[in-house]
């Protein structure tokens, strides 16, 4: 590597590579400064002058140290069935995720492209598998001895209460009715809810610690390559 005191632009020694936050400019054949996240290259470097960077305009961003001529456009505004979990800033793209009660039917690298409402299990059916951020609720018929009298994306089938004397037998959509004032024991003191699916508001307000992903662009090389070998083509 060249000595750390070398200032950009500088010609790298044969076989060496540009330093962190620098790139090799094929035209100038020099190691030049990259622009920091939130900026882009306004003027490319020459043999005598370094890269000139400028801030990204509104609704555009760069997430990486770069030398792109223009910042990337932020994704479109989140739809009504989505919440914005990461705002568009000069350094990161907007991320939209599904709002509570919805799941992602069509995902993209970061966030969701298409949300759909979580299925609600009708009376006589309970939740067999709860909805997640990326999968719908799966319903199942209530087995004998259990019931569900709600239309819900979270309620499971609950056991019928046990009666001393049964007034009305329970079925898949209704609990048993006892003649005595109170059953000998109740196995179903109240509605049983499954945990909320992963896509909940509390988790929207605490996004995971991964930053948004910039589109794959060949000119976003994190480190400058070595000067090209004889006969190879430039970027």
């Amino acid at each position: 590597l060249p000595a750390q005191v070398a200032f950009t632009p500088y010609a790298p020694e044969p076989g060496s590579t540009c330093r962190l936050r620098e790139y090799y400019d094929q035209t100038a054949q020099m190691c030049c400064s990259k622009c920091s996240p939130g900026q882009h290259a306004k003027v490319f470097c020459t043999k005598t002058s370094d890269t000139v960077c400028d801030s990204c305009e509104d609704s555009t961003y760069t997430q990486l140290w770069n030398w792109v001529p223009e910042c990337l456009s932020c994704g479109s505004r989140c739809s009504s069935d989505q919440v914005e979990t990461q705002a568009c800033t000069r350094e990161q793209n907007r991320i939209c995720t599904c709002r509570p009660g919805w799941y992602c039917a069509l995902s993209k690298q970061e966030g969701c492209r298409l949300c759909a409402p979580l299925r609600k299990c009708r009376p006589g059916f309970g939740v067999a598998r709860p909805g997640t951020e990326t999968s719908d609720v799966v319903c199942k018929p209530c087995a004998p001895g259990t019931f569900s009298n709600t239309t819900s994306s979270t309620d499971i089938c609950r056991p019928h209460q046990i009666c001393n004397v049964v007034a009305i037998p329970g079925n898949a959509s209704m609990d048993a009715v006892c003649t005595s004032t109170s059953p000998t024991r109740s196995m179903a003191p109240g509605a049983v809810h499954l945990p909320q699916p992963v896509s909940t508001r509390s988790q929207h307000t605490q996004p995971t610690p991964e930053p948004s992903t910039a589109p794959s662009t060949s000119f976003l090389l994190p480190m400058g390559p070595s000067p090209p070998a004889e006969g190879s083509t430039g970027d």
Partner: antibody
Framework: QVQLLESGGGLVQPGGSLRLSCAAS????????MSWVRQAPGKGLEWVSI????????FYADSVKGRFTISRDNSKNTLYLQMNSLRAEDTAVYYC????????????WGQGTLVTVSS | DIQMTQSPSSLSASVGDRVTITCQAS??????LNWYQQKPGKAPKLLIY???TLQTGVPSRFSGSGSGTDFTFTISSLQPEDIATYYC?????????FGQGTKVEIK
Amino acid sequence: QVQLLESGGGLVQPGGSLRLSCAASGFTFSTYAMSWVRQAPGKGLEWVSIISDGGDATFYADSVKGRFTISRDNSKNTLYLQMNSLRAEDTAVYYCARDGTSAAAFDSWGQGTLVTVSS
Amino acid sequence: DIQMTQSPSSLSASVGDRVTITCQASQDITNFLNWYQQKPGKAPKLLIYDASTLQTGVPSRFSGSGSGTDFTFTISSLQPEDIATYYCQQSDSYPITFGQGTKVEIK
């Protein structure tokens, strides 16, 4: 979400070779520089190597230079570390990590794979 | 190579205490300093980059400051889940180097 999954670790004799892999998902792999960091049992973190997003720039720690080779296959979303002439002091958990801003700040890590060099 | 010296190597504090860890670089690294948390048996987690920028999703009780050669990492109110080893790392130049780590325990 970002996921990195290392594999290929195991027991190898001194002087032997091993190739580690890191399968990436949940992000545009070809946009990010990737790195290997290791941790000897009961010790601190030691950076091993880094590779640019396109794979055409690589850097190594002096302790592994000439013995280890970092590479990547962007079509398979996979990072590799070829380790030759292994020594007892290479025994460690090896982590692959994503460089989040192309400035050597590692924002996502795999769970690690243990490499034991012993006779 | 740039050497990173962390202190103390370990500390014990009570829940709610303010905890401070320092990191010194052997040469000027501007603000290219990152802090990681590593819990036993787990991979490290980036908490702070560029000396003072909090990584997305990291609680605000964690903070960092400093530039040049002297840097500080602070937990404003220690929580039981903060039991871990903390590492500083310079990202100014290759080879990338880490501090030796600071183990934080609860009294």
